[in-house]
Interface confidence: low
Amino acid sequence: QPDAINAPVTCCYNFTNRKISVQRLASYRRITSSKCPKEAVIFKTIVAKEICADPKQKWVQDSMDHLDKQTQTPKT
C-alpha cells in the first residue's frame, strides 16, 4: 500500500465572523502551509474548542499578542 506523506496539515476554509473574548482563549497556532488555501490562525479556547480566524483582522492580531505576552510572563 502507498505510504502517507509527511505529517498531517490542518487547514481553514472559512473564518469566524465573531470576535472571541481574549479571556476565553488559551492558545493559538498559525497555519501557513502552501497546501492550505488560506493563511489562518487557529485559536484554542479554554474549553479546548478550535476556531479558525483571519490573521489580517486586528482583533486576531491583538489576541495573538495578548497570548504571546501571557506565555512570556512566568506564572507564580
Epitope: Q1, P2, D3, A4, I5, N6, A7, P8, V9, T10, C11, C12, Y13, N14, F15, T16, N17, I31, S33, S34, K35, C36, P37, A40, I42, K49, E50, I51, C52
Partner: antibody
Framework: SLEESGGDLVKPGASLTLTCKAS?????????MCWVRQAPGKGLEWIAC????????TYYASWAKGRFTISKTSSTTVTLQMTSLTAADTATYFC?????????????????????WGPGTLVTVSS | AYDMTQTPASVSEPVGGTVTIKCQAS??????LSWYQQKPGQPPKLLIY???TLASGVPSRFKGSGSGTEYTVTISGVQSDDAATYYC????????????FGGGTEVVVK
C-alpha cells in the same frame, strides 16, 4: 465525467503518458485531480494528485516519486507520465477527483474522498 | 505510514443478512476515513466519507462508524446488488488529502 486514455502494451523500461479529460465536473478551490491504479485482481493504490486550482501543486505517494509525474495541462486535462516501467506497473489506471470536505468555521483536516472516477485505462508491461 | 488493515478479506451472507467490514489504521486517523464499493470491471464508487457520512444516492442500509484507529461499515438487509469488493481509505496524511487504501473485502451475497 472523467475519461482516461493512453493505456497500451509496452515493453519493460519503456515510458508512457496517460491523459485524463474532465467534462461537466466542477473543479473548485477544494478539489484535486488524481491517479489511482489497480493491478489485475489486486487492491487500489493511490499514485499522485494535482491541485485543480490555481496553485497546481502536486503530491505523490512515496513509492511513486521520481518515476511518475502528474501535470495539469489545461483546466480540464491532467497527464501522468510514467518512466522505467516494469511488469509490476501493469494495472488499470483510474483518474479520480479528490474533493475536500470541511465544517465552517472550525479547522478541517482537509478531509478528502474520491467522489468521481473515470472507467480506467489498462497499461500492460510485458516483453 | 498510516497502514490500513481490512478484515475479513472475504465474507458471504444471504440476502437480508447483515455484513460488517472492519478497517484498522496503524495509528489514529481521527475519522478521516472513506469507504468505496467496486464491482468487477467498474471503477470504485464512493459510499461513505468522514467515517459516517453517506455519499449522495447511497442507500441507508449502509452505515459507517468508528473512531481513532478502528472503523466499520455495516450493510443491514444486504441485497444481491451489494455483491462487490469494499475498500476503506484514510485521508489523514500530508495535507490530509492523500491516502492509503485498505486491502479490500469481497462481499458475496448468497
Amino acid at each position: 465525467s472523467l475519461e482516461e486514455s493512453g493505456g497500451d502494451l509496452v515493453k519493460p523500461g519503456a515510458s508512457l503518458t496517460l491523459t485524463c479529460k474532465a467534462s461537466g465536473i466542477d473543479f473548485s478551490l477544494y478539489s484535486y485531480m488524481c491517479w489511482v491504479r489497480q493491478a489485475p485482481g489486486k487492491g487500489l493504490e493511490w499514485i499522485a494528485c494535482v491541485d485543480a486550482g490555481a496553485s497546481g501543486s502536486t503530491y505523490y505517494a512515496s513509492w511513486a516519486k521520481g518515476r511518475f509525474t502528474i501535470s495539469k495541462t489545461s483546466s480540464t486535462t491532467v497527464t501522468l507520465q510514467m518512466t522505467s516501467l516494469t511488469a509490476a506497473d501493469t494495472a488499470t489506471y483510474f483518474c479520480a477527483r479528490g474533493i475536500l470536505y470541511y465544517t465552517w468555521p472550525y479547522p478541517a483536516g482537509a478531509i478528502d474522498a474520491f467522489d468521481s472516477w473515470g472507467p480506467g485505462t489498462l497499461v500492460t508491461v510485458s516483453s | 505510514a498510516y497502514d490500513m488493515t481490512q478484515t475479513p478479506a472475504s465474507v458471504s451472507e444471504p440476502v437480508g443478512g447483515t455484513v460488517t467490514i472492519k478497517c484498522q489504521a496503524s495509528e489514529s486517523i481521527s475519522n478521516y476515513l472513506s469507504w468505496y464499493q467496486q464491482k468487477p470491471g467498474q471503477p470504485p464508487k464512493l459510499l461513505i466519507y468522514k467515517a459516517s457520512t453517506l455519499a449522495s444516492g447511497v442507500p441507508s442500509r449502509f452505515k459507517g462508524s468508528g473512531s481513532g484507529t478502528e472503523y466499520t461499515v455495516t450493510i443491514s438487509g444486504v441485497q444481491s446488488d451489494d455483491a462487490a469488493t469494499y475498500y476503506c481509505q484514510q485521508s489523514y496524511s500530508s495535507s490530509n488529502v492523500f491516502n492509503t487504501f485498505g486491502g479490500g473485502t469481497e462481499v458475496v451475497v448468497k
